[in-house]
Interface confidence: low
Amino acid sequence: AGHLEQPQISSTKTLSKTARLECVVSGITISATSVYWYRERPGEVIQFLVSISYDGTVRKESGIPSGKFEVDRIPETSTSTLTIHNVEKQDIATYYCALWEV
């Protein structure tokens, strides 16, 4: 079975900068999985943000500003990355990655 690890326990960002979060997949080939990213803002329910499927298809939650989040999968490092552009106060949250094995 696949295993997920998010190396950065916490991240402090300067406003307007770009944050890149990592999710390392082990125990299974990342190219044969779909990776989902979620965020949980303080006091709010967890929310789906974006996913990248085994075939590279990216799906984003409607209502999220275009270009705000970019998701990718890097086979060389078996890592999925979530890039958050133009970091602002509304982006303060806990971000989770999840795995769907095909």
Epitope: S11, T18, G67, E70, D72
Partner: antibody, heavy 125, light 109 residues
């Protein structure tokens, strides 16, 4: 081998246009922000433009804003710079450079870690 | 716009000597967002230091970076023949995203 190769430079008259290309190989091109940096003869480095991984964020130096357009094709691992209304002061070697962006853990800038060999653009009548 | 000013313009030293290059920002820059590059004649620049003090892959430990706020330093502890080149500092910001210093040439005395 991780590599960037620029092409498209040459001699052009003032007011003319030129399109530069940069081909990436040996790495997952779509995962990196990309930049164009230029260097006039005998001068220092000048950042020209940058583009984010999915082209959602694009920036230009004031000196080229409105005249240059950066774009990328992740399916072809290529970066382009369309240069219009060229001026004599645009004469320079143009480099494309890979940008590793901002690291989250530790919060630091990784820098431009891979550069092409450069392509010369000469604007003269 | 943040202006990066490097000094001296030229540094004349002998192999084996210590080189100290300065980079000053017109306003405070996070040390996290400061990089140094080396460029030799006819070649593309090469990343040396990122995050003000972290050496890039393959860079020898005679190169070190330090500083914070507006003042940053690149030190080459013992100059070797291949170290004679031009060095640039660069800051990452948001308007514009990048600014380079004008460069410091390290030449053989």
């Amino acid at each position: 081998e991780v590599q960037l190769v620029e092409s498209g430079g040459g001699l052009v008259k003032p007011g003319g246009s030129l399109r530069l290309s940069c081909a990436g190989s040996g790495f997952t091109f779509r995962s990196y922000d990309m930049n164009w940096v230029r260097q006039a003869p005998g001068k220092g480095l000048e950042w020209v433009s940058s583009i984010s991984t999915s082209s959602g964020y694009i920036y230009y130096a004031d000196s080229v804003k409105g005249r240059f357009t950066i774009s990328r094709d992740n399916a072809k691992n290529s970066l382009s710079l369309q240069m219009n209304s060229l001026r004599a002061e645009d004469t320079a070697v143009f480099y494309c450079a890979r940008d590793r962006g901002i690291a989250v853990a530790g919060d630091y800038y990784y820098g431009m870690d891979v550069w092409g060999q450069g392509t010369m653009v000469t604007v003269s009548s | 716009e943040i202006v990066m000013t490097q000094s001296p313009g030229t540094l004349s030293l002998s192999p084996g000597e210590r080189a100290t290059l300065s980079c000053r920002a017109s306003q405070s820059v996070s040390s996290s967002y400061l990089a140094w590059y080396q460029q030799k004649p006819g070649q593309a620049p090469r990343l040396l230091i990122y995050g003000a003090s972290s050496r890039a892959t393959g860079i020898p430990d005679r190169f070190s970076g330090s500083g914070s706020g507006t003042d940053f330093t690149l030190t080459i502890s013992r100059l070797e023949a291949e170290d004679f080149a031009v060095y640039y500092c660069q800051q990452y910001g948001s308007s514009p995203p990048y600014t380079f210093g004008q460069g410091t040439k390290v030449e053989i005395k």
